[in-house]
Interface confidence: low
């Protein structure tokens, strides 16, 4: 029967006794930077070309004996997971291996850099179709390794990496912390995060998604027909590299941003038991398990968005946190979150010719997060319209005054330390077309976009008494672009998007007490692009 | 605490010293920074990636590497250029004493220097 991991990533319509998805990634070349491999294994024979690249450190210890099968173990298994005949994800993908890890599975940042440079030069000398680079390795945070990954990604290469097996924040490791890399955590057959001895999968905001990574059957280097079960975030990353190869084979023109958004979109949502993660990391860690799309046809009609969390601002009074979208994504909205509830809101601002989302800590606060909603919106023209705090008692308003521009998100930022104590009137972001409305002492920022066929609507869900969490979701066919909270009273910790749901978090009800001012409303802005839908229909 | 770019994990040292007559000060008076792995057992001191500013050409990278070697030799230090990077990042990989970091950070075109460190199969 089909191994659990292949079943897990396969949409129901493809499930049969055998895993046989259409089109096996044959247009794509996958580079593997790992140990040496046994290229003659039946799973990968004829599918993997061993390059002459080798840059590894000496093995530790004078008594270490090189044993070929052990030296090849990690890389052979991963090559099999990506493209193996029977146990592989993308059975049609061709692979090239570079040796950057020694027989003990150890390498160096410099060796990995030189390997990435080798790939770039190969790409320049002999341009081929889409390239996927699998980096099933991790070291401490490295500015230079992250920078090299960024450059290669900007050259059109898709990089997939292991989140790391340290049961820790993936942002402390490289290349896992590189924003341009697709970082993959590991889950098991029960959709639990993988435990590895006393450690386990990494987690946090630098993880893009999870994939099967425990008890994965694949090629063993012990013999050319041997199989073995291995576990780790490397195995998880290999699944995603295979899925990426499949997607790119179906749609070779996909950009990295488009691919990442599709990986997120087609993932299984909210299936991971988050209790395994440290409490402060749960909100930051994506509850997504990778899966193949239900069809090889693209989903070009879909408006894709994802949530990007910033690093924590730190606790100083004027501390800020910044969340950024990828170069070819549009920032459609910006929100903020603070566990202490002490924050001064957020704003969208231009930085280096691109909009970023900046959240502001407040006096006595433990720090804030900025949360960007990053979307794929072709031919978009987006801008931010700001209204300073209003002198009138009613509140501050700002709208999208340009014809054809629609409101995709509202942010508010205030200088007063605790807006909540003022108990002001706070108005809903409706009324005049394309309008954000807010507290009279806050500046209001409207994200206004014009794009072919873009249409948006608002959905609100209000709860009259304080609740720790209020949510509102966009309907099928609509994508959440904006998420904010009304009113801005002191017990609201912030708002953020989880998949297509807007979540507004408040302080523990028991500590705030239930007052008439305690009402909390979650406001979602839901958009869709009829232009993308039309274009997709015309292609088919 | 973490800054907005997520670099809080590294130890960032901005090494300044008296003007070294043999080294040109970096352009615009900016000081290049030194980075090393926050996890001590994974550090590989003695090998450094010298990263040059983005638009630096290969010939400038090679010239900067040679200049470092020459200036180090005048001080009685042996250095070895292990690799010159181009195509992704401009720069070079050098085996040298940590004593030379102050000197290297003042070389023209230098953006930052990172001490090599280990990576592991996951």
């Amino acid at each position: 029967s089909i191994p659990w991991n292949l079943e897990r990533i396969t949409p129901p319509r493809y499930r049969a006794d055998e895993y046989q998805p259409p089109d096996g990634g044959s247009l794509v070349e996958v580079y593997l930077l790992d140990t040496s491999i046994q290229s003659g294994h039946r799973e990968i024979e004829g599918r993997v070309m061993v390059t002459d690249f080798e840059n590894v450190p000496e093995e530790d210890g004078t008594r270490f004996h090189r044993q070929a099968s052990k030296c090849d173990s990690h890389g052979t298994h991963l090559a099999g997971v990506v493209s193996g005949r029977d146990a592989g994800v993308a059975k049609g993908a061709s692979m090239r291996s570079l040796r950057v890890l020694n027989c003990q599975g150890k390498g160096t940042v410099s060796g990995t850099l030189i390997g990435l440079e080798f790939i770039r030069k190969s790409q320049l000398v002999q341009p081929v179709g889409p390239l996927v680079v699998l980096l099933p390795l991790a070291g401490g945070y490295s500015r230079v390794l992250n920078a090299a990954c960024q450059r290669l990604a900007r050259a059109g290469v898709v990089l997939v990496t292991a989140a790391g097996n340290f049961r820790d924040d993936a942002c402390l490791y490289s290349p896992a912390s590189a924003p341009e890399v697709i970082t993959v955590g590991a889950t098991n057959a029960q959709d639990q995060p993988v435990t590895l001895g006393t450690l386990g999968t990494n987690f946090g905001r630098c993880v893009d998604l999870f994939a099967p990574g425990e008890d994965i059957i694949g090629a063993s280097s012990d013999c050319s027909t041997c199989y073995v079960s291995q576990s780790g975030t490397s195995q998880a990353a290999a699944h995603v590299a295979g899925i990426a190869a499949m997607m790119l084979s179906a749609e070779p023109e996909l950009t990295l941003a488009e691919l990442r958004q599709r990986l997120i979109h087609f993932s299984a949502k909210d299936v991971i038991n988050e209790a395994w993660f440290p409490e402060d990391q749960r909100v930051l860690t994506p509850n997504l398990v990778a899966a193949l799309p239900p069809s090889t046809h693209g989903a070009g009609w879909q408006l894709f968005c994802r949530t990007v969390w910033s690093a924590h601002s730190g606790p100083t009074r004027m501390a800020t946190a910044v969340a950024r979208c990828a170069p070819d994504e549009e920032l459609l909205s910006c929100s903020s979150f603070s566990r202490s509830g002490k924050r001064r809101g957020e704003r969208m601002e231009a930085q280096g010719g691109k909009l970023v989302c900046r959240a502001h800590n407040a006096f006595g606060g433990e720090g804030v997060y900025a949360i960007a909603r990053c979307c794929l919106l072709p031919q978009a023209n987006c801008s931010v319209h700001t209204a300073p705090p209003a002198e009138a008692s009613m509140g501050t308003r700002v709208h999208c005054h340009q014809q054809g521009h629609v409101l995709t998100g509202c942010s508010s930022h205030w200088e007063v330390e605790d807006l909540g104590t003022h108990k002001p009137p706070v108005l809903r972001p409706r009324g005049q077309p394309n309008q954000c409305v807010g507290h009279r002492e806050a500046s209001i920022h409207a994200s206004c976009c014009h794009a072919p066929g873009l249409e948006c609507k608002v959905k609100e869900h209000g709860i009259p008494a304080p609740q720790e969490q209020v949510t509102v979701a966009c309907e099928e066919g609509w994508t959440l672009t904006g998420c904010s909270a009304l009113p801005g009273t002191s017990h609201v910790l912030g708002a953020y998007a989880v998949d297509n749901t807007c979540v507004v978090r408040s302080r523990d009800v028991s500590t705030t007490g239930s007052t008439s001012e305690g009402a909390v409303t979650a406001v979602a802005i839901c958009c869709r692009s009829r232009h993308l839908a039309q274009a997709s229909q015309e292609l088919q | 605490q973490e800054d907005e770019d997520g670099d809080y994990e590294e130890l960032v040292l901005a090494l300044r010293s008296e003007e070294d007559g043999l080294a040109e000060a970096p352009e615009h008076g900016t000081t290049a920074t030194f980075h090393r792995c926050a996890k001590d057992p994974w550090r590989l001191p003695g090998t450094y990636v010298v990263v040059l500013k983005e638009e630096t050409h290969l010939s400038q990278s090679e010239r900067t590497a040679r200049r470092l070697q020459a200036q180090a030799a005048r001080r009685g230090y042996l250095t070895k250029i292990l690799h010159v990077f181009h195509g992704l990042l401009p720069g070079f990989l050098v085996k040298m004493s940590g004593d030379l970091l102050e000197l290297a950070l003042k070389l023209p075109h230098v953006d930052y220097i990172e001490e090599d460190s280990s990576v592991f199969a996951q």
């Epitope: 009613m394 409101l407 995709t408 009324g431 005049q432 409305v437 249409e455 | -």
Partner: antibody, heavy 121, light 109 residues
Framework: EVQLLESGGGLVQPGGSLRLSCKAS????????MHWVRQAPGKGLEWIGR????????KYNEKFKGKATISRDNSKNTLYLQMNSLRAEDTAVYYC??????????????WGQGTLVTVSS | DIQMTQSPSSLSASVGDRVTITCRAS??????LTWYQQKPGKAPKLLIY???SLQSGVPSRFSGSGSGTDFTLTISSLQPEDFATYYC???????????FGGGTKVEIK
């Protein structure tokens, strides 16, 4: 629950005037534009004008400029329509409607029950 | 000024029938077209906004399509409660005003 309740209709002499009221409840009155629409007996719907209760800004159908005046009292959550120089052809049911904003589109999403104005001697 | 022309002005149909009403604008109104339903003695009720977006609570048998100048309201399977008058409405940019179609009365055959 959003509710709009009109009042002030009735029999009016030709040349006379009247003021219709529309009391809103169940939402933040100042956050939504409000419209007046009328419907003569057996006829279709005809837009009179609208107001932004937040700032009092108004727009009118050319046909009603000088004849209709729309105002509001935010403290009472109430919308008004003042009609002058009434004639027999102004006989109609007058509706107030809230202008719901569906980000990127607009629609009159809640309507009052209507109040009948009859102009006759 | 924009004129909105609805056709037919009335139609007779039976329960279960598929009914199509058209609305034509004298100039391009983009997607800013709304459909309302009105029953005798009652206020109009919002059905569809932005040409094709179904207002929440409206049965899915109602659908709207079109953009620019030609729009359609379709009732896929007419129900007894659907016998009413249907109005289209557009926004006139030049006047900053709102224009209704003449209405289509759907009667029992």
């Amino acid at each position: 629950e959003v509710q709009l309740l009109e009042s002030g209709g009735g029999l009016v002499q030709p040349g006379g005037s009247l003021r219709l009221s529309c009391k809103a409840s169940g939402y933040t009155f100042s956050s939504y534009w409000m419209h007046w629409v009328r419907q003569a007996p057996g006829k279709g719907l005809e837009w009179i004008g609208r107001i932004d209760p937040y700032n009092g800004g108004t727009k009118y159908n050319e046909k009603f400029k000088g004849k209709a005046t729309i105002s509001r009292d935010n403290s009472k959550n109430t919308l008004y329509l003042q009609m002058n120089s009434l004639r027999a052809e102004d006989t109609a049911v007058y509706y107030c409607a809230r202008y719901g904003y569906y980000l990127g589109s607009y629609a009159m999403d809640y309507w009052g029950q209507g109040t009948l104005v009859t102009v006759s001697s | 000024d924009i004129q909105m022309t609805q056709s037919p002005s009335s139609l007779s149909a039976s329960v279960g029938d598929r009914v199509t009403i058209t609305c034509r604008a004298s100039q391009d109104v983009s997607r800013y077209l709304t459909w309302y339903q009105q029953k005798p003695g009652k206020a109009p009720k919002l059905l569809i906004y932005a040409a094709s977006s179904l207002q929440s609570g409206v049965p899915s048998r109602f659908s709207g399509s079109g953009s620019g100048t030609d729009f359609t309201l379709t009732i896929s399977s007419l129900q007894p409660e659907d016998f009413a008058t249907y109005y289209c409405q557009a926004y006139d940019y030049s006047l900053s005003g709102y224009v209704f179609g003449g209405g289509t009365k759907v009667e029992i055959k």
